[in-house]
């Protein structure tokens, strides 16, 4: 089990001519939100096919109103990551769809209307536990910059989140047949549920239900000690007549590695080194050919005409990795100081500074509370470069100048108007809606009075019928 995480860095006009019109206007302010859909494998399925690995919806971004005459800038983004939990193993290869949605906030009957601004899709290889991978995708005249990673949830570890780790019972070493869990060296790999009766001291398993023996032990449950005296062959079947037990077949005998993988014995088991285009414990996961389009970011695919031959991706400048999936990451040098977010724009590096810091590399610390007063009895709190007012009861906002507004969270549904009241809040519903917060349409079939379908609903159908 684990979590796929997506961080949107920017969404705005792409380079080149034909800048898109701003999606928001002074008459129709709007805000963005994002939807991500994940599917296992490298299949580029239709956008409507189920998101078998999971899907997530971001929070709504800040409200944006176009400044007349100004070019469309990068639009303000929602805070936080999009997180897609996955329950089973991380597949290693996956397809994604990222949609950018616009929520119009005009006074139209029925409340906010949703429309799809842009959709990007791609296919990637990604090992769980690795660093953030950065990406840029274009949809028409729009450009989306984002990073993503997959991480395992404890106790799972490994590139597929299939190995389990537990805290070490003994301080010095892991139990027999169990190795330390890199990078958590103070933890040990947890045993799988092996074949019933498999010796816990002398047996282990790589797959549930099997029983493999440590050196010096044999038998179906690894309970029989190996005696090498008076044994003729160094490795062969046990001899019931002489009582001589010899080690069973070695882990690499018969080469368990498929598709031309080479096998090497390890103290516990074996390890397969797979040829390019194959992966998995035994190189059993089928190869990818040039016909599958495995090279990303404009990489040129060479060879690999059939599944038995490898392909090679020749990457364009600025990209690397066996599938050109990695941007050459100049941000890995961490040029942004004081927790600033580094953006590699290709032509330049840019630092997005945390509140309270400024400068090309966020190197200037602004004196946050100097000359700043918090109104209405609030006190200024300085921390981590960010000025903050701790407001007295009943007040809010950056400087405590605003009365705490129960309507700030937009609690009325379907375009209902919120009014602050001494007892809390009151929603005045748009015609055709009822309920304390206008969440009940009186006649739901009157589609004209309802908002457009948000993500996850069939186009043109404002409700979901189950």
């Amino acid at each position: 089990a684990g979590v796929f995480e997506l961080q949107i860095h920017s969404f705005g006009p792409g380079p080149g001519p034909g800048a898109p019109r701003s999606p928001c206007s002074a008459r129709l302010p709007c805000r963005l939100f994002f939807r991500v859909c994940l599917k296992p494998g490298l299949s580029e399925e239709a956008a409507e096919s189920p998101c078998a690995l999971g899907a997530a919806l971001s929070a709504r971004g800040p409200v944006y109103t176009e400044q007349p005459g100004a070019p469309a800038p990068d639009l303000p983004l929602p805070d936080g990551l999009l997180q897609v939990p996955f329950r089973d193993a991380w597949p290693g290869t996956f397809s994604f769809i990222i949609e950018t949605w616009r929520e119009e906030l005009g006074d139209q009957i029925g409340g906010p209307a949703w429309s799809l601004l842009a959709r990007v899709a791609g296919r990637r290889r990604l090992a769980a536990g690795g660093p953030w991978a950065r990406d840029i995708q274009r949809a028409g005249a729009w450009e989306l910059r984002f990073s993503y990673r997959a991480r395992c949830e404890p106790p799972a570890v490994g590139t597929a989140c299939t190995r389990l780790c537990r805290p070490r019972s003994a301080p010095s070493r892991c139990g027999p047949g169990l190795r330390p869990c890199a990078p958590l060296e103070d933890e040990c790999e947890a045993p799988l549920v092996c074949r019933a009766g498999c010796s816990p001291e002398h047996g282990f398993c790589e797959q549930p239900g099997e029983c493999r023996c440590l050196e010096g032990w044999t038998g179906p449950l690894c309970t029989v000690p190996v005696s090498t005296s008076s044994c003729l062959s160094p490795r062969g079947p046990s001899s019931a007549t002489t009582g001589c037990l010899v080690p069973g077949p070695g882990p690499c005998d018969g080469n368990p590695c498929a598709n031309g993988g080479s096998c090497s014995e390890t103290p516990r088991s074996f390890e397969c080194t797979c040829p390019r285009g194959f992966y998995g414990l035994r190189c059993e996961v089928s190869g990818v050919t040039c016909a599958d389009g495995p090279c990303f970011n404009g990489g040129l695919c060479v060879g690999g005409a059939d599944p038995d031959s490898a392909y090679i991706c020749h990457c364009p400048p600025g990209f690397q990795g066996s599938n050109c999936e990695k941007r050459v990451d100049r941000c890995s040098l961490q040029p942004c100081r004081n927790g600033g977010l580094c953006l590699d724009l290709g032509h330049a590096l840019r630092c997005r500074c945390r509140a309270g810091f400024a400068g090309p590399r966020c190197e200037h610390d602004l004196d946050d509370c100097a000359g700043r007063a918090c109104a209405n009895g609030g006190t200024c709190v300085e921390g981590g470069g960010a000025h903050r007012c701790s407001c007295a009861l009943g007040f809010g906002g950056r400087d405590c100048r605003e009365r705490a507004d129960p309507c700030a969270a937009r609690p009325c549904a379907h375009g209902g108007r919120c009014y602050a009241h001494f007892s809390g809040l009151v929603c005045a519903c748009a015609p055709g809606y009822m309920g304390a917060r206008c969440e009940f349409p009186v006649h739901p079939d009157g589609a004209s009075a309802l908002p457009a379908a948000p993500p996850g609903l069939r186009p043109g159908d404002p409700q979901r019928y189950l």
Epitope: L57, P112, A413, G435, A436, R437, E439, F440, P444, P451, P454, G456, L457, P462, Q463, R464, L466
Partner: nanobody
Framework: EVQLVESGGGLVQPGGSLTLSCAAS????????LAWYRQAPGKKRELVAG???????VYIDSVKGRFTISRDNAKNSVYLQMNSLRAEDTAVYYC???????????WGQGTLVTVSS
């Protein structure tokens, strides 16, 4: 994804009572506003009664005093107690959920209530 399954519909005589149940899965009922709608043959679907996530209730005039909506968050269910039933209450009754976290609405498949002597 919220799934809603209604039960409790059937044939009842005028003046009789019936209780409809709706079991929700896929989301905690405490995070949902829930309602009962009905659709009589040849008519538009209409709201009957609703209960917000804070417990406040709403009814259409024609059922006030006769129908009661309630919820049991522990059982992830919403109920409609219908008393003094009339022939004009005959309809397919649908369970409805409004999920606040993403403003999505969900519907059940419906259960038929027939009031006839």
């Amino acid at each position: 994804e919220v799934q809603l399954v209604e039960s409790g519909g059937g044939l009842v005589q005028p003046g009789g009572s019936l209780t409809l149940s709706c079991a929700a899965s896929g989301s905690a009922v405490s995070m949902l506003s829930l309602a009962w709608y009905r659709q009589a043959p040849g008519k538009k679907r209409e709201l009957v009664a609703g209960i917000s996530d804070d417990g406040s209730q709403v009814y259409i005039d024609s059922v006030k005093g006769r129908f009661t909506i309630s919820r049991d968050n522990a059982k992830n269910s919403v109920y409609l107690q219908m008393n003094s039933l009339r022939a004009e209450d005959t309809a397919v009754y649908y369970c409805y959920a409004y999920r606040w976290e993403d403003a999505l609405t969900y519907w059940g498949q419906g259960t038929l209530v027939t009031v006839s002597s």
